[in-house]
């Protein structure tokens, strides 16, 4: 069967069950249900999944059986709408059930919550986890899928299957080890960090598709795949882009069975045609399906072909530019983006898209001018400042990161972003600024040629987190403007924001700066978050505070925590010394 050209199936649910196999089918249905109904208990979801699975089996046995011809959205939506507590638990989401497909599914999608009110996942003791794993491995792994999916409603479902496979492997290996904790905990930390990164990357893909449309996503994919597969022909890249767009559209739309099935087909196609795509795929293509798909998605850029001709000849110097553009605008612009991207693995994808947009805008203007050639002759000169802006920004920030280290670099960004958008909630500012600060450790170690794609494309992912969290409860027109005007200019838009002069400082509340002995038992990371939360609150109270003033207060605060955590009577120390610290800080900041 060719990629995505399937025979018509009498029963879609039977078709997907047969393609994916029972294990993957059940896992994907569980993920889908948990991503839609994020508050439902685990047991309720398992029950729904088992019912759907039993029904699918009857359709496999007889595709003409009753209801087997229904669409997956109809079947799954009907099942979700049987949940008894829908109105009490989800409020207006229950109104979705009064709608018909496809409106009902769209309604469910609109109610996905990027920041659900769920308790933080607390990791039990290793022995407790190993016992649970051995007692009922299937339930243990399902619980993992459920907990991740409900907290990350846009997590890339086929990739979550890969994470679950690694999660299982970690427990299988480490629960037999002499030192279970030493074996298991680093693996779980790695999975957690990779999982958060994977979730955020996928969230940007879904935002790109849903907020800016298919054309925006395809442009992103052309640029990225052209960098990754510079030896591939434009038609090959175009085919991969079309197929990849279908896969991500399905996953972002909640069509997880189709998405996983099509992703497997795409991996198969890539591996069957790797000679025409990239020399770097050999190892990936020898792996089992889930590992193979993950490996392809992360594969390093192939080497650029030697002797690529100059782009100026055909895209600037030629008298036929406007003829070419008029004949087939999207193909011509697509080729421009492909040709530019394959020559520039050193550029971020968003920079390449800015250049392509500048080129398009110039042609739109110049091809209507009296002398088009004269008008567009200098278009490549317009690229220079666009390239230099991220280069300079990365250079400055990497120097700052190397000077301060990650924690203090995060603090500098916390101050910077709180002054830009002080209306944003403190937890969001802390989370986003901490992630922005991680760009230093992630990217500044790279040589110049790899810094920009690493840094700016990572920042796009993090700023998208800010955008989706802010969209849920909008509080700042400036955030809304930067998030909605242009996908590729989000980072420059935020970078360009100065201190918000219209902001009325927050009333001082001593309770915000009252700390207790429980801070002493927190992990280093949690303690940092407490201190960073206080820093954001300080800036919200005193947005005009200088770096020096804030540094002095934060140094005093760090000394206060250290002193009281060493005290015999910690709680008394925190109460008494805390009052003094608040008074001193108020004086230092003129509050």
């Amino acid at each position: 069967r060719g990629v995505f050209r399937r025979d018509a199936h009498k029963s879609e649910v039977a078709h997907r069950f047969k393609d994916l196999g029972e294990e993957n089918f059940k896992a994907l249905v569980l993920i889908a249900f948990a991503q839609y109904l994020q508050q439902c208990p685990f047991e309720d979801h398992v029950k729904l999944v088992n019912e759907v699975t039993e029904f699918a089996k009857t359709c496999v046995a007889d595709e003409s059986a009753e209801n087997c011809d229904k669409s997956l959205h109809t079947l799954f939506g009907d099942k979700l709408c049987t949940v008894a507590t829908l109105r009490e638990t989800y409020g207006e989401m229950a109104d979705c059930c009064a709608k018909q497909e496809p409106e009902r599914n769209e309604c469910f999608l609109q109610h996905k919550d990027d920041n659900p009110n769920l308790p933080r996942l607390v990791r039990p003791e290793v022995d407790v986890m190993c016992t649970a794993f051995h007692d009922n491995e299937e339930t243990f792994l399902k619980k993992y899928l459920y907990e991740i999916a409900r907290r990350h409603p846009y997590f890339y479902a086929p990739e979550l299957l890969f994470f679950a496979k690694r999660y299982k492997a970690a427990f299988t290996e480490c629960c037999q080890a002499a030192d279970k904790a030493a074996c298991l905990l680093p693996k779980l930390d790695e999975l957690r960090d990779e999982g958060k990164a994977s979730s955020a990357k996928q969230r940007l893909k879904c935002a790109s598709l849903q907020k800016f449309g298919e054309r925006a996503f395809k442009a992103w994919a052309v640029a990225r795949l052209s960098q990754r597969f510079p030896k591939a022909e434009f038609a090959e890249v175009s085919k991969l882009v079309t197929d990849l767009t279908k896969v991500h559209t399905e996953c972002c739309h909640g069509d997880l069975l189709e998405c996983a099935d099509d992703r497997a087909d795409l991996a198969k196609y890539i591996c069957e045609n790797q000679d025409s795509i990239s020399s770097k795929l050999k190892e990936c293509c020898e792996k089992p399906l889930l590992e193979k798909s993950h490996c392809i998605a992360e594969v390093e850029n192939d080497e650029m072909p030697a002797d690529l001709p100059s782009l100026a000849a055909d895209f600037v110097e030629s008298k036929d530019v406007c003829k070419n553009y008029a004949e087939a605008k999207d193909v011509f612009l697509g080729m421009f983006l492909y040709e530019y991207a394959r020559r520039h693995p050193d550029y971020s994808v968003v920079l390449l898209l800015r250049l392509a947009k500048t080129y398009e805008t110039t042609l739109e203007k110049c091809c209507a001018a009296a002398d088009p050639h004269e008008c567009y002759a200098k278009v490549f000169d317009e690229f220079k400042p666009l390239v230099e802006e991220p280069q300079n920004l990365i250079k400055q920030n990497c120097e700052l990161f190397e000077q301060l280290g990650e924690y203090k670099f995060q603090n500098a960004l916390l101050v910077r972003y709180t002054k830009k958008v002080p209306q944003v909630s403190t937890p969001t500012l802390v989370e986003v600024s901490r992630n922005l600060g991680k760009v230093g450790s992630k990217c500044c170690k790279h040589p110049e040629a790899k810094r920009m794609p690493c840094a700016e494309d990572y920042l796009s992912v993090v700023l998208n987190q800010l955008c989706v969290l802010h969209e849920k409860t909008p509080v700042s027109d400036r955030v809304t403007k930067c998030c909605t005007e242009s996908l590729v200019n989000r980072r420059p838009c935020f970078s360009a924001l100065e201190v918000d002069e219209t902001y009325v400082p927050k009333e001082f509340n001593a309770e915000t700066f009252t700390f207790h002995a429980d801070i002493c038992t927190l992990s280093e990371k949690e303690r940092q978050i407490k201190k960073q939360t206080a820093l954001v609150e300080l800036v919200k109270h005193k947005p005009k505070a200088t770096k020096e003033q804030l540094k002095a207060v934060m140094d005093d605060f760090a000394a206060f925590v250290e002193k009281c955590c060493k005290a015999d009577d910690k709680e008394t120390c925190f109460a008494e010394e805390g009052k003094k610290l608040v008074a001193a800080s108020q004086a230092a900041l003129g509050l």
């Epitope: 022909e233 434009f234 038609a235 090959e236 175009s238 045609n273 025409s276 072909p305 690529l308 001709p309 782009l311 000849a313 055909d314 895209f315 036929d320 003829k323 070419n324 004949e327 087939a328 193909v331 011509f332 697509g334 080729m335 421009f336 492909y338 040709e339």
Partner: nanobody
């Protein structure tokens, strides 16, 4: 009506050179993809080399890399294939083809829309 007319084929000794030309009429070399294919007796048609008329990027099948060079002259609507260090296994009918760059792939002749009649290249001593 689109027409592609190949020329330059002939008999040449192993190690020798030939230059094939393909004159296109009925369409202009705008945003298109031009390619050379060959078919030896009893074998399937295979892609040799292709070039984009915009951007000028070139692609070659592994067996001819370093020996053959594709080029184009957009002002003359003409495609060329310079063949050096010819071998007996290069013997075939060589076809010129054209298509859209969004579709044409060297490994798949069906992705090219227009074809010439072919010119025979024989490499023999």
């Amino acid at each position: 009506e689109v027409q592609l007319l190949e020329s330059g084929g002939g008999l040449v000794q192993p190690g020798g050179s030939l230059r094939l030309s393909c004159a296109a009429s009925g369409f202009t070399f705008l945003t298109s993809c031009m390619g050379w294919f060959r078919q030896a007796p009893g074998k399937e048609r295979e892609g040799v080399s292709s070039i984009y008329t915009v951007g000028g990027s070139t692609f070659y099948t592994n067996s001819v890399k370093g020996r053959f060079t594709i080029s184009r002259d957009n002002s003359k609507n003409t495609l060329y294939l310079q063949m050096n260090s010819l071998r007996a296994e290069d013997t075939a009918v060589y076809y010129c083809a054209a298509g859209s760059p969004a579709r044409c792939r060297l490994r798949d002749p069906t992705t090219f829309d227009y074809w010439g009649q072919g010119t025979l290249v024989t490499v023999s001593s």
